[in-house]
Amino acid sequence: GSVPPMVNVTRSEASEGNITVTCRASSFYPRNITLTWRQDGVSLSHDTQQWGDVLPDGNGTYQTWVATRICQGEEQRFTCYMEHSGNHSTHPVPSGNSHHHHHHHH
């Protein structure tokens, strides 16, 4: 059977006026997954995103991540979109450094 991913979005300061937002998916099976950043619902071009490899996490499941740099103040326009085993979810950028969003999707 399939195991849905845990999805976690974090933010960190990049350079002045910019932040790096990272979307991590973990504990999912099988390994095929779509993870991408969207702006206003439109996928960002590949050259503006960085992806991690899909790696085993030691529990028979997998993990991966995608990151991009955005302008501070524009966070509301951006979401991380995940598709896995016929299910999908959308994840906003948390409002501040201390906020992390963890969601398990079924």
């Epitope: 969207r38 206003d40 619902g41 439109v42 979401t79 979810s89 959308t90 906003p92």
Partner: antibody, heavy 118, light 108 residues
Amino acid sequence: EIQLVQSGAEVKKPGSSVKVSCKPSGYAFTSNNIYWVRQAPGQGLEWIGYIDPYIGRIIYNQQFKDRATLTVDKSTSTAYMELSSLRSEDTAVYYCSRSGERSNFDYWGQGTLVTVSS
Amino acid sequence: EIVLTQSPATLSLSPGERATLSCSASSSISSNYLHWYQQKPGQAPRLLIYRTSNLASGIPARFSGSGSGTDFTLTISSLEPEDFAVYYCQQGGSLPLTFGQGTKVEIK
């Protein structure tokens, strides 16, 4: 086949409100944003706002944020745009559209003509 | 707000001729955020070209797009009867999302 079907034409009095519906089919409703755009007779296209049906986030064109209300009903996979305090200048065709993988508007509804007249 | 100015407002040409439509932006736009739409009378717009130069699904190869920065172009290499319509450019780089005022391609 992806389709967005909108509600029928409306005639409204100045000062009243109108609510236009948009029912997409052919894809997972919550996977794409729904945009709203209007076009006055013989004029160009004007973006009103969009809603993310999955998380319910709404982004408005500031020009419309005081009068437009975007909502979705996930149980019926339907999006709505309500415009209040109507005036004659709001006479237009109102379109819903779906956000695409690579562009803001990849599929469009057929449009709903809203006529504001006393 | 990024203002998109399309020129000319009307283009009068005959079938078989080449059409060149311009879209000028008030601020620089990444090529990823400039799109073109076609609209025929009584119909909704339809996506023609996305991200400056990519043909949308089902759009014939006589359509092409180019440009960068503030100047973008839509070209129809040889006009077919069904190409006579209004064409809009649109930017998605900054809010509010905006459209050009349109160029009408009419039969001469």
